[in-house]
């Protein structure tokens, strides 16, 4: 059988090879499609309800004003010339539908280093056959699954038009110390060959590179945190991170009701103010980051070291912030 | 929403003439064939005529051939019916229906419209 | 020309029944077949096209059937608004031919 592809909606003939070019002609086509069960046979003659979708013409031909999916499928004629001798022709018909240009919607305007980011979603309308969605980084093709590429993919079909909706979601993890502005593009490729490519204008996202996290710092002085009844505590909570963050300060795991300071006076200890110390900084852009945790103690007088199992009340007693 | 609204019947004696309209809106109108079905008082539906998207084409039952004359303007979405040598037998409600080939039969209707044949 | 041979041409049955309309084609018209329904006074309604498939907006108790040239409309529980006059068509070859119709009535 030969090969046609047609595009939807755009007129086709079929010429019935061996047919004499006027009537009176002894032909007959007989079409085996979507629209038939079986085989449906078409004569010069006919003329009806399948006149919308093909008719004979009076050169014998097969005329289908406008082809759609259902036509897809098995066209044969039958003739006989004038010595009656029989010729017969044999089609294939595939059709097709380019959709319109490939759209990136969603895309994000910018991308962090190191992790997953959703790029954007690159839709397909309106092709037939589906067809297939590729993503391209900076000019070369992304392989899903490789180096923190990942593509959600999706195919819809338009309940009367019978056409192609395509999704395609890309997710990268960009490299640190990478491209600052890489050059992200999507192309539908037809599922019929010898259609060219369609890509999408560009889009192209800053990748922001975020700065790792230096440690905070909580400086006791005295050094050990051990200090005799009546004495003064001074924790310091050191942050490099520029701006300053934000410092709260914890007790034995629970947040102290003071305003944000970086440093913490306990002036005058008691017994109540025996426990664990531990700063918060909270950073805009980071969440909050909370240091290690110091033990205060009270030394009796005579004592080498804190004294064992000496743990305060709840009470905070008198607390100066610096 | 699609619409059909057909128009002109009335009472005519036998032999003369009627022309029948029939308003289309909501679809596109040149996309499809359109056809005229009829159905006396009291009986069943009976094909009447049909036209091609294009206009190009007309088909007729044996029973209104050269009597009738079905045509459309897609310029003013609009089709049409004309009835010459009336006989007692046309009388019917006369509807007007989209399609009419095989891509989808007769999908949607008008109210239909009375046509009388009497002296 | 196609005849359409619509049976029974009546017939009466009571809410929840299940009802069988059938039309035998003279010839074979494939799958290009509907079925209408019809009140008095009121146009046709689309209910069935090509054969099995229901059009858009009718309930799911009326279903369409095919073997060979007999095209079958069934209605699994009559309703009340389902007494009314019921047509096949056939749109494979002109002339374009209805059955006869089959009026259910309320028993």
């Known amino acids: 059988a030969q090969n046609i592809t047609a595009r939807i909606g755009e007129p086709l003939v079929l010429k019935c090879k061996g047919a004499p070019k006027k009537p009176p002609q002894r032909l007959e086509w007989k079409l085996n499609t979507g629209r038939t069960e079986a085989w449906k046979v078409l004569s010069p003659q006919g003329g009806g309800p399948w006149d919308s979708v093909a008719r004979v013409l009076p050169n014998g031909s097969l005329f289908l004003p406008a082809v759609g999916i259902q036509d897809e499928g098995i066209f044969r004629c039958q003739a006989m010339n004038r010595n009656g001798k029989e010729t017969k022709s044999n089609y294939r018909v595939r059709v097709y539908q380019i959709p319109g240009k490939p759209e990136i919607v969603d895309s994000a305007s910018e991308l962090t280093a190191g992790v997953p980011n959703k790029v954007g979603t690159c839709v397909s309308e309106g092709s037939y056959p589906a067809g297939t969605l590729s993503w391209h980084l900076d000019g070369k093709p992304l392989v899903p699954n490789e180096k923190g590429v990942s593509v959600k993919e999706q195919t819809r079909r338009h309940p009367e038009t019978g056409l192609f909706t395509l999704q395609s979601e890309l997710m990268v993890t960009p490299a640190r110390g990478g491209d600052p502005r890489p050059t992200f593009s999507c192309s539908f490729s037809p599922g019929l060959p010898r259609h060219r490519a369609l890509r999408t204008a560009p889009i192209q996202p800053r990748v922001w590179e975020p700065v790792p996290l230096e440690e905070v710092q909580l400086v006791v002085e005295p050094e050990g945190g051990a200090v005799a009844p009546g004495g003064t505590v001074t924790l310091t909570c050191e942050v490099p991170a520029q701006p300053s963050p934000q410092i709260h300060w914890m007790k034995d795991g629970v947040p102290l009701p003071l305003p944000p300071s970086p440093v913490l006076i306990l002036p005058e200890i008691g017994p109540q103010d025996q426990g664990t110390y531990s700063c918060v900084a909270t950073h805009s852009s980071h969440g909050p980051q909370e240091s290690r945790a110091v033990s205060i103690s009270i030394i009796e007088p005579g004592e080498e070291g804190p004294t064992a199992g000496s743990v305060g009340g709840s009470g905070l007693g008198t607390l100066a912030l610096a | 929403e699609v619409q059909l609204v057909e128009s002109g019947g009335g009472l005519v004696q036998p032999g003369g003439s009627l022309r029948l309209s029939c308003a289309a809106s909501g679809f596109t109108f040149n996309n499809y064939w359109m056809t005229w079905v009829r159905q006396a008082p009291g009986k069943g539906l009976e094909w009447v005529a049909s036209i091609d998207n294009s206009g190009d084409n007309t088909y007729y039952p044996d029973s209104v051939k050269d009597r009738f004359t079905i045509s459309r303007d897609n310029a003013k979405n609009s089709l049409y019916l004309q009835m010459n040598s009336l006989r007692a037998e046309d009388t019917a409600v006369y509807y007007c229906?989209?399609?009419?080939?095989?891509?989808?039969?007769?999908?949607?209707w008008g109210q239909g419209t009375l046509v009388t044949v009497s002296s | 020309d196609i005849q359409m041979t619509q049976s029974p041409s009546s017939l009466s049955a009571s809410v929840g029944d299940r009802v069988t309309i059938t039309c035998r084609a003279s010839q074979d018209v494939g799958i290009y077949v509907n079925w209408f329904q019809q009140k008095p006074g009121k146009a046709p309604r689309r209910l069935i096209y090509?054969?099995?498939n229901l059009a858009d907006g009718v309930p799911s108790r009326f279903s369409g059937s095919r073997s060979g040239t007999d095209f079958t409309l069934t209605i699994s529980s009559l309703q009340p608004e389902d007494f009314a006059t019921y047509y096949c068509?056939?749109?494979?070859?002109?002339?374009?031919?209805f059955g006869g119709g089959t009026k259910v009535e309320i028993k």
């Open positions: 068509l056939e749109f494979d070859e002109h002339p374009l031919t």
């Open positions: 229906a989209r399609g009419g080939d095989i891509r989808e039969g007769l999908r949607y």
């Open positions: 090509r054969a099995t």
